[in-house]
């Protein structure tokens, strides 16, 4: 994917000291604060902007590949737009005073240039054939070779952002996505479960037939018991899900009504806050192109390359450069859908999704038949869901916990809150479940307020 727009930093990931809010040289020249610009733009029809010196004039924006050289002299007169110079670009219609600098691919991360920068599109960086991307952060990826699944078979083939998922042959176990011989399995390791028959057989060779058969009998006995248990669990889950569709799926009309007027905050800070649209102040810049400059005031989750979601080719600029602003955003509480919390002595809080208890409470209280829909809405791909189910074998609860942990890990901390989960549950018409989760975590008496942001 294309890197963000910091042009001058080369191979060693050296970072210019931007700690005092100094804006980068990557965007050649300064751009008016986007928040103010949006207010001005909203008065004019689409494709036009308000003249900075005369509020009554709407000037036509410049096409992508060009930048604003001079504002239009009067109504109905042309804006003076000039084409971007080599090494710079604008990816959408704009009224930027200067073009954005082209990104460079991170060679030390194994990245290669998929397509070079043009006046209307930033550099696109990616990985070589038979490699996949591992994201260290929202916009920094490294290329790794796909696993070949030696001594095993390919369960899920290698994808752009996902390594091959291997299933190992008998006598081998999966360690760091490679099939390793069971002879390398030590008692303390997880592999003992998978390599159990082999380990037992090794011990049994020196003794008579009973020592060989006994472990096998025990093993198959355990298998039968577990099958019986799974059968019972399956019936229980079906019963539980039916109950949930009745109890959990419908919330009281008053609550639904109360929510009508609630405006939910965007999932991430509004991109309009970025002082320099193409700049992503991550260490040594971003590998996902932040080339699509937008001055729209709405910020939909679809625009955000949420860590859990398969990233789209375009990422919004990171809102890191203005600490005061970022802090203000962070401290702004997200409205909680639970009215009972509003009525209680405590204001609604984000329960800590860093705490495993929170994630287990979600696992326990989301109807099993709606689980996949739930995690898909959180942004997990079917590929990841299958992989986590496979990795956790027969233990559905652990697979579901792993899915939430994956979402939690990949979602920037300020966004991975119970409010976000609540919003998803509300969209699924499962508000009752959210109440059950809150109840499971807080009990009947409200706990002291948890921190409203995950740190």
């Amino acid at each position: 994917m294309g890197l963000s727009t910091v042009p001058d930093l080369l191979l060693p990931l050296v970072l210019l000291e931007l700690l005092v809010g100094i804006y980068p040289s990557g965007v050649i020249g300064l751009v008016p604060h986007l928040g103010d610009r949006e207010k001005r733009d909203s008065v004019c029809p689409q494709g036009k902007y308000i003249h900075p010196q005369n509020n009554s004039i709407c000037c036509t924006k410049c096409h992508k590949g060009t930048y604003l050289y001079n504002d239009c002299p009067g109504p109905g007169q042309d804006t003076d737009c000039r084409e971007c110079e080599s090494g710079s670009f604008t990816a959408s219609e704009n009224h930027l005073r200067h073009c954005l600098s082209c990104s460079k691919c991170r060679k030390e991360m194994g990245q290669v240039e998929i397509s070079s920068c043009t006046v209307d599109r930033d550099t696109v960086c990616g990985c070589r054939k038979n490699q996949y991307r591992h994201y260290w952060s929202e916009n920094l990826f490294q290329c790794f070779n796909c696993s070949l699944c030696l001594n095993g078979t390919v369960h899920l083939s290698c994808q752009e952002k996902q390594n091959t998922v291997c299933t190992c042959h008998a006598g081998f176990f999966l360690r760091e996505n490679e099939c390793v011989s069971c002879s390398n399995c030590k008692k303390s390791l997880e592999c003992t479960k998978l390599c159990l028959p082999q380990i037992e057989n090794v011990k049994g060779t020196e003794d008579s037939g009973t020592t060989v058969l006994l472990p096998l009998v025990i093993f198959f006995g355990l298998c039968l018991l577990s099958l019986l248990f799974i059968g019972l669990m399956y019936r229980y889950q079906r019963w539980k899900s039916k109950l949930y569709s009745i109890v959990c799926g419908k919330s009281t009309p008053e609550k639904e009504g109360e929510l009508e007027g609630t405006t939910t905050k965007p999932l991430a800070p509004n991109p309009s806050f970025s002082p320099t649209p193409g700049f992503t102040p991550t260490l040594g810049f971003s590998p996902v192109p932040s080339s699509t400059f937008t001055s729209s005031s709405t910020y939909t989750p679809g625009d955000c390359p949420n860590f859990a979601a398969p990233r789209r080719e375009v990422a919004p600029p990171y809102q890191g450069a203005d600490p005061i602003l970022a802090t203000a955003l962070a401290s702004d509480p997200i409205p909680n859908p639970l009215q009972k919390w509003e009525d209680s002595a405590h204001k609604p809080q984000s329960l800590d999704t860093d705490d495993p208890a929170t994630l287990y409470a979600v696992v326990e209280n989301v109807p099993p038949l709606r689980w996949k829909e739930f995690v898909r809405r959180l942004g997990l791909s079917d590929h990841e869901i299958d992989r986590l189910e496979l990795q956790n074998g027969r233990c559905l609860r652990e697979a579901q916990y792993s899915m939430l942990a994956t979402w939690r890990r990949r979602t920037p901390r300020r966004e991975a809150t119970l409010e976000l989960l609540g919003r998803v549950l509300r969209d699924m018409d499962l508000l009752g479940c959210l109440e059950d989760i809150e109840e499971a975590l807080c009990g009947p008496a409200a706990l002291p307020p948890a921190p409203s942001l995950l740190r």
Epitope: W136, N177, L283, P323, D354, R409, P412
Partner: nanobody, 122 residues
Framework: EVQLLESGGGLVQPGGSLRLSCAAS????????MGWVRQAPGKGLEWVSM????????YYADSVKGRFTISRDNSKNTLYLQMNSLRAEDTAVYYC???????????????WGQGTLVTVSS
């Protein structure tokens, strides 16, 4: 509250070795990619090395490849950096940090430890 406490720095001769440790608390350490960042005197910040939650993916800056080894012990909530064949240019303050943070985002510095100073000099 997130806390990261780095230790193990000190004065060492060129060619010598050091092992840095970072004790983490206040968050679920085992679910985060972590890394070591350094700041040489009068210079900017640089990612030295990174490791994913399972220890499967690792990254090393070109300047330290083959000399430094990153590892983690999730049961102890600790991140390590084994530094061998140290050079004068490795002199810096070393910090541990979560990789999903832009290092220019000032409030994030509130969650950093004091760092540990590594001085390589004869």
């Amino acid at each position: 509250e997130v806390q990261l406490l780095e230790s193990g720095g000190g004065l060492v001769q060129p060619g010598g070795s050091l092992r840095l440790s970072c004790a983490a608390s206040g968050f679920t350490f085992a679910t985060y990619s972590m890394g070591w960042v350094r700041q040489a005197p009068g210079k900017g910040l640089e990612w030295v090395s990174m490791i994913d939650p399972e220890g499967y993916h690792t990254y090393y800056a070109d300047s330290v490849k083959g000399r430094f080894t990153i590892s983690r012990d999730n049961s102890k909530n600790t991140l390590y950096l084994q530094m061998n064949s140290l050079r004068a240019e490795d002199t810096a303050v070393y910090y541990c940090a979560e990789t999903n943070r832009p290092l220019t985002y000032k409030p994030w510095f509130d969650y950093w430890g004091q760092g540990t100073l590594v001085t390589v000099s004869s």
